[in-house]
Interface confidence: low
């Protein structure tokens, strides 16, 4: 059964202190066989018992193993059905807790009733606050039966359910007519799918004989042990305050498990923890009683004393549930309660026994679930014990189940049942996944979904070149880590397969499906050389480089130029996607910045060696644009430009640059320097007649500044075509009329 416990804290004086906690002891709770599985769910189930809406309950998770529900504000919030769901896949299990109001008119004598198929179930509702009206019984929220109020026996209303069947399972309630449903007595009836002591399809298999109040699961024959007991047959008591299938959990708080109700997977239901009883699980067991709800009686013999948590504590020389077995009766020693083997293995199982007379080889036998008896092949006889070794024939899945080691001597006999789990070695359902590749290595994620059983102990990756008949190379890796296949050939396809293993002999599964993974191209080896660079503006840089001449084709797809701005700690990368390129224009750079520059050849995702770096200082940015640029035609070949100096100059202007371009023309523009920076006017001569021109200008201090607005003007008349524009400057004060 799934190791899932729902704990209810029954300190009911203050609903705000009430909480429900669901604890999973499953290995990797919330984890499926190959990936994160569904989490624990804990919720109030309002389908049958509806309560007035209140503030939402608070859910707090403690890892994937525990979830707690708090935030109850009033007693009515507590009444009803709560459920916890845990486990993955086919093992997904729901645990149910039914909460009754302590102030209800009717209270259940016992909330959880677990009965066998065909039994008679009797639900008993005790009168707590009498009302002289009929009592309505409901099953799963639907009307079921009515009792007249005179029919109470000893202050109890009884509902008898003869010959119950599994569909009769569910939530039952007893309510006074016209009373609030919150004052009902709520019960939970669990009907096992088989008669007493039987389990399995057709109920043909015999239960192991669960001890200490454990209940045999009708599907798998396992004992669902009460809180505080463990072992295949619940034969072992946990120490006080412990619960869970391996006693691995501990009750919270200083008073141990006092005041806690424990709910376990069906068909167990709910009870107090070991050593406690009462409707609120706050009363210790009476002398001579022990276990969950104090339902068990000690009846210790031979001087044994009764411990309310674990039962009889035997004096030296005695053992057994009631201290009824003398240490001289043969005793099987330290037999594991559960063993795990892999399918088709032939394990050796050891069974050690002591006693007087001393057990010999022939007195110890091993019985399989199908009744086959195995005799030991050898025995190791020591002064204090005999260990018989059994060679088990090749295991099949049907060998899963309860095996039994039995020792018989004239002093008596002892037997110990233990569970054998036959596990199927895991087989990958998918191929491994390629994460990254280089020219000589592949990084692979090996763990994929698989059939068969976990946990995965080792992952073997088999690989070889595609279409090769050479032996497979194998690498053993940790299941949780990605693996790097090294020393591969560049640009080569490899067939890669995964083989999974689980713990134990014969745990290796079959190989999974192959996948093709191809290594990257070879890394480039040539180191470029920076031939030169040229500043084309405050934010533009032209770079040129060369490569050494080598025989054969060039191994490369292009070049990566890197500019490092050490002041700002920024790197600029420029990709030149042609391997034939030997020059590049870098734009959008920061004026006045000192850059370190290098270039590398790249091939696929691999970078070759970087060139020796160059250090480049870009000039600072220039001044603002000249203002109010104006163009005025003077003749068929002359146009006068006038402007105002830029504002907020960072320094003295060294010159102005005028750009002249024929409007709509396809040719390059012409740049003309005005070398007398104090002037605010110039005449551009040598223009063509009746031609529209575009002009703009900028100032220069250390670097060229921003362009002004563009102005347009046409030359006059139909004069002769000029040689080309030239310039003559004068100060604006001279004016055109002089």
């Amino acid at each position: 059964a799934v190791d899932l416990t729902l704990l209810a804290n029954l300190r009911l004086t203050d609903p705000q202190r009430f909480f429900l906690t669901c604890v999973s002891g499953e290995a990797g709770a919330g984890r499926g066989s190959d990936a994160w599985g569904p989490p624990l769910l804990l919720e109030k189930d309002d389908r049958i018992v509806r309560t007035p809406p209140g503030p939402p309950l608070r859910l707090a998770r403690n890892g994937s193993h525990q979830v707690t529900l708090r935030g109850f504000s009033k007693p009515s919030d507590l009444v009803g059905v709560f459920s916890c769901v845990g486990g993955a896949g086919a093992r997904r299990t729901r645990v149910i807790y039914v909460h009754n109001s302590p102030g209800a008119h009717l209270l259940p004598d016992k909330v959880t009733h677990t009965v066998n198929k065909g039994d008679t179930a009797v639900l008993s509702a005790r009168v707590h606050k009498e009302k002289q009206t009929d009592v309505i019984w409901k099953s799963n929220g639907s009307y079921f039966y009515t009792l007249d109020w005179h029919e109470a026996q000893d202050g109890r209303f009884l509902l008898q359910l003869p010959n119950v069947q599994p569909p009769s399972s569910g939530i039952y309630s007893a309510t006074y007519l016209e009373a609030s449903p919150l004052g009902s007595a709520f019960f939970r009836l669990i009907v096992r799918g088989c008669g007493a002591g039987r389990w399995g399809p057709g109920c043909t298999k015999e239960c192991p004989g669960c001890l200490h109040g454990g209940v045999c699961h009708d599907h798998d024959g396992e004992c669902v042990c009460p809180p505080g007991f463990t072992g295949t047959r619940c034969e072992q008591a946990c120490r006080e305050g412990r619960f869970g299938q391996s006693c691995q959990e501990q009750c919270p708080g200083i008073s141990g498990c006092r005041g806690l109700t424990f709910c376990l997977p069906d068909p167990y239901g709910c009870s107090c923890g070991s050593g406690w009883r009462g409707s609120q699980c706050q009363e210790a067991c009476a002398p001579g009683h022990f276990g969950a709800d104090c339902r068990l009686q000690c009846q210790c013999q031979n001087g044994g004393t009764c411990d309310r948590f674990s039962g009889c504590v035997c004096p030296s020389g005695w053992h057994g549930v009631h201290c009824e077995k003398s240490d001289r009766i043969p005793q099987i020693l330290n037999m594991a309660s559960e063993l795990e083997f892999n399918l088709e293995t032939m394990p050796r199982i050891n069974c050690a026994a002591a006693g007087n007379p001393f057990p010999v080889r022939g007195s110890i036998e091993l019985r399989k679930p199908d009744g086959t008896v195995l005799l030991s092949t050898k025995a190791i006889v020591e002064p204090e014990k005999t260990t018989a070794e059994f060679e088990v024939p090749r295991l099949v899945l049907a060998d899963s189940g309860f095996w039994e080691c039995r020792v018989s001597t004239s002093g008596g006999q002892d037997s110990r049942r233990f569970k054998v789990n036959v596990k199927v070695p895991p087989v990958p359902l998918a191929a491994p996944r390629l994460l990254t590749k280089q020219s000589r290595q592949l990084v692979v994620s090996p763990l994929v979904s698989f059939s068969g059983d976990g946990p995965i102990s080792t992952v073997r990756l088999h690989y070889r070149p595609q279409d090769s008949t050479m032996d497979w190379s194998t690498i053993v890796v940790d299941p949780s880590e990605n693996v790097t296949l090294m020393n591969l050939r560049p640009k080569t396809g490899y067939s890669v397969r995964v083989q999974l293993s689980r713990p134990g002999e014969g745990g290796e599964g079959a190989w999974g499906p192959p996948t093709l993974m191809t290594t990257d191209c070879p890394e480039p080896l040539l180191q470029p050389w920076l031939e030169g660079w040229h500043v084309e503006g405050t934010d533009r840089l032209r770079v040129s480089w060369s490569l050494p001449l080598v025989p054969g084709p060039l191994v490369g797809d292009g070049f990566l130029l890197r500019l490092w701005d050490g002041t700002r700690g920024q790197e600029r990368r420029e990709n030149v996607s042609s391997p034939q390129a030997r020059t590049a224009l870098l734009t959008g750079l920061t004026p006045g910045t000192h850059y370190q520059l290098d270039v590398q050849l790249y091939h696929c995702t691999l970078l070759g060696p970087a060139s020796p770096p160059a250090h480049v200082l870009l000039p600072p940015s220039g001044p603002p644009a000249p203002r109010h640029l104006h163009a005025q035609a003077l003749s068929d070949s002359e146009i006068q430009l006038t402007w105002k100096h830029p504002e907020a100059l960072p320094g003295p202007i060294s010159k102005y640059v005028v750009e002249v371009q024929v409007a709509g023309g396809a040719g390059d523009p012409l740049w003309i320097d005005v070398d007398r920076p104090e002037e605010t006017s110039t005449i551009i001569r040598g223009l063509n007649a009746s031609t529209r021109y575009l002009f703009r200008m900028r100032a220069s201090i250390q670097g060229l500044g921003d362009w002004s607005n563009t102005v347009e003007e046409s030359t006059l008349g139909n004069g002769l075509q000029a040689e080309g524009p030239v310039q003559e400057s004068r100060a604006a004060e001279e004016g055109l009329d002089q």
Epitope: S246, V313, A336, L339
Partner: antibody, heavy 121, light 109 residues
Framework: EVQLLESGGGLVQPGGSLRLSCAAS????????MQWVRQAPGKGLEWVSS????????YYADSVKGRFTISRDNSKNTLYLQMNSLRAEDTAVYYC??????????????WGQGTMVTVSS | QSVLTQPPSVSGIPGQRVTISCSGN????????VTWYQQLPGTAPKLLIY???RRPSGVPDRFSGSRSDTSASLAISGLQSEDEAEYHC??????????FGGGTKLTVL
């Protein structure tokens, strides 16, 4: 508080005898499998002996078999190790230990502080 | 000569992940689980990992155990200076005898 307290160690000549005791408190001693484990100076741990709760079964390492005897008195909550024919290689800190929490067989979660046994002429 | 084999020493820097191996044979590792102990200088051993990979309450989740066939390993991630100690692996053999490794000294550099 759960506690194991060893005593009885000391200096003894080769061939001599010594009896170690281990007093248990804070748990139901009579229900637990008990162990002696030793550690020679600068060396690893070595399992010496174990005894079942009733005292009905005892186990010994090959290196001490026939020379050492483990026993217990459940009424006194005490574990003993009678060591005879002592040798120089028996020099070690001797710990008593138990697996109180029902973990796996080799998982001893309660240990004493140890008692030193020196075998030297 | 210890029955289980461990490296005499390992070392690591704070924050690093280190692993300690422990190998045995079919008699002791075959159907029995592995336990790991931490022993600080001058003190008794402390249970660290049981049943191959389970941690008792109070042991940080930086410590993890795994095993396959006849070898086991203890991994310590996010190494801290207080992890400097001797680490011992242990198991039970098929004759119901306890077996230990020789111990591994972990040094935090």
């Amino acid at each position: 508080e759960v506690q194991l307290l060893e005593s009885g160690g000391g200096l003894v000549q080769p061939g001599g005898s010594l009896r170690l005791s281990c007093a248990a408190s804070g748990f139901t001693f009579s229900q637990y499998l008990m162990q002696w484990v030793r550690q020679a100076p600068g060396k690893g741990l070595e399992w010496v002996s174990s005894i079942y709760p009733s005292g009905g079964a005892t186990y010994y390492a090959d290196s001490v078999k026939g020379r050492f005897t483990i026993s217990r008195d459940n009424s006194k909550n005490t574990l003993y190790l009678q060591m005879n024919s002592l040798r120089a290689e028996d020099t070690a800190v001797y710990y008593c230990a138990t697996r109180k929490d029902g973990y796996s067989r080799s998982a001893f979660d309660i240990w004493g502080q140890g008692t030193m046994v020196t075998v030297s002429s | 000569q210890s029955v289980l084999t461990q490296p005499p020493s390992v070392s690591g820097i704070p924050g690093q992940r280190v692993t300690i191996s422990c190998s045995g044979n079919n008699s002791n590792f075959g159907s029995n689980t592995v336990t790991w102990y931490q022993q600080l200088p001058g003190t008794a051993p402390k249970l660290l990992i049981y049943s191959d990979s389970r941690r008792p309450s109070g042991v940080p989740d930086r410590f993890s155990g795994s095993r396959s066939d006849t070898s086991a390993s203890l991994a310590i991630s996010g190494l801290q200076s207080e992890d400097e100690a001797e680490y011992h692996c242990a198991a039970w053999d098929d004759s119901l005898n306890g077996v230990f490794g020789g111990g591994t000294k972990l040094t935090v550099l």
